[in-house]
């Protein structure tokens, strides 16, 4: 149990203890949510105190102060999703439909995702929110008819599945137009039959 002497400058529990070179001893770190209020000596272990309101320490530490909680900046597109506690800093995230445009250890600036025009969709990324949309054309047999950052290409309607016949083929930007087999002129409505 700390404090104890250490000749090789290493401690048994690296996470919860630290080496104090002046006395050449291993002392306890303070747990998350606390800080060092009195340093250790050969005869007394570290004394810890709870972080004051609006401050925190996330890890086992031997800091003599707590870190100040910082708000998220909505002007930069960042929003708090969990408040600061004594053990955890404010959790910020880009607002939905935005991506992180600037990083400095953590995201500092978010921007709106670009719209993908009709006939395209946003390429799915492994790490969502880390970059702007890259729009790719709808694959064969699919369409997308809006300008949107998140709309997905949908499969063309199969007229025969509805007992109808194709009046006009679908494109990358529009659905198939179907009509009743008995009709000579195609109706205006895409993908469905006008009664």
């Amino acid at each position: 149990v700390p404090p104890y002497g250490s000749e090789n400058q290493t401690c048994r529990d690296q996470e919860k203890e630290y080496y104090e070179p002046r006395h050449r001893i291993c002392c306890s770190r303070c747990p998350p949510g606390t800080y060092v209020s009195a340093k250790c000596s050969r005869s007394r272990d570290t004394v810890c105190a709870t972080c004051a309101e609006n401050s925190y320490n996330e890890h086992w530490n031997y800091l003599t102060i707590c870190q100040l909680c910082r708000p998220c900046d909505p002007v930069m597109g960042l929003e708090e999703i969990a408040p600061c506690t004594s053990k955890r800093k404010t959790q910020c995230r880009c607002q939905p439909g935005m991506f992180c445009a600037a990083w400095a250890l953590e995201c500092t600036h978010c921007e709106l995702l670009s719209d993908c025009p009709p006939g395209t969709e946003a390429e799915l990324k492994d790490e969502v929110g880390k970059g702007n949309n890259h729009c790719v054309p709808c694959k064969a047999g699919h369409f997308q008819n809006t300008s949107s950052p998140s709309a997905r290409c949908q499969p063309h309607t199969r007229c025969e599945d509805q007992g109808l016949v194709e009046a006009a083929p679908g494109t990358a930007q529009s659905d198939t137009t179907c009509r009743n087999p008995s009709e000579s002129l195609p109706p205006e409505m895409s993908g469905t039959m006008l009664m």
Epitope: P71, C72, P74, E79, I81, P96, S150
Partner: antibody
Framework: EVQLVESGGGLVQPGGSLRLSCAAS????????MNWVRQAPGKGLEWVSG????????YYTDSVKGRFTISRDNAKNTLDLQMTSLRAEDAAIYIC????????WGQGTMVTVSS | DIQMTQSPSSLSASVGDRVTITCRAS??????LAWFQQKPGKAPKRLIF???SLDSGVPSRFSGSGSGTDFTLTISSLQPEDFATYYC?????????FGGGTKVEMK
């Protein structure tokens, strides 16, 4: 302590209008997206509408687009939902929620649509 | 729109049981997922955010995992106060969407 208090619910006929309000306190209102979520009796949660912190961007679920309008007053810490052309399927408890990850919720206000 | 499919829709369990609820997104949402608990007549309460981060004051028997499209909420040892309905929710993009809910009932 965060508090969200909804008001304005009631009985309305199909096709009618209603304006819901949410009074917020205990947090920096202008820093958060604010949302309306609804829950029909015995059913699950459905997000209805949201507004960005500055009020410059609004979002709606498809079934209410063109009928509902969300707005906020950051000076008064209030969130509103103007509902028009109400339908039977709009009947639900409407709850105001803080943040896009719904950190805190109000208790809700009941909207009944019936003739 | 991103569809959130939750399973099972209901389950029966006993106090002390380990309970697992899954949620699948129709497209990748990274870790932009929250879990909520709702009891009858009460407003929902958030338990987990960013897929695996525990909200302040939530018991450590609750845990979340997953990223991309597949997510899990686990209750390591079910307590009497945990009988409730649980919902997942994605906040990657608008429209924000919830799963259909999982009702955890007493066996």
């Amino acid at each position: 302590e965060v508090q969200l208090v909804e008001s304005g619910g009631g009985l309305v006929q199909p096709g009618g209008s209603l304006r819901l309000s949410c009074a917020a306190s205990g947090f920096t209102f202008s820093s958060y997206t604010m949302n309306w979520v609804r829950q029909a009796p015995g059913k699950g949660l459905e997000w209805v509408s949201g507004v960005a912190p500055s009020g410059d961007r609004t979002y709606y679920t498809d079934s209410v687009k063109g009928r509902f309008t969300i707005s906020r007053d950051n000076a008064k810490n209030t969130l509103d939902l103007q509902m028009t052309s109400l339908r039977a399927e709009d009947a639900a408890i409407y709850i105001c929620a803080q943040g896009f990850a719904f950190t805190n919720w109000g208790q809700g206000t009941m909207v009944t649509v019936s003739s | 729109d991103i569809q959130m499919t939750q399973s099972p829709s209901s389950l029966s369990a006993s106090v002390g049981d380990r309970v697992t609820i899954t949620c699948r997104a129709s497209q990748g949402i990274s870790s932009a997922l929250a879990w909520f608990q709702q009891k009858p007549g009460k407003a929902p309460k958030r338990l987990i955010f960013d897929a695996s981060s525990l909200d302040s004051g939530v018991p450590s028997r609750f845990s979340g995992s997953g990223s991309g499209t597949d997510f899990t909420l686990t209750i390591s040892s079910l307590q009497p106060e945990d009988f409730a309905t649980y919902y997942c929710q994605q906040y990657n993009n608008y429209p924000l969407t919830f799963g259909g809910g999982t009702k955890v009932e007493m066996k």
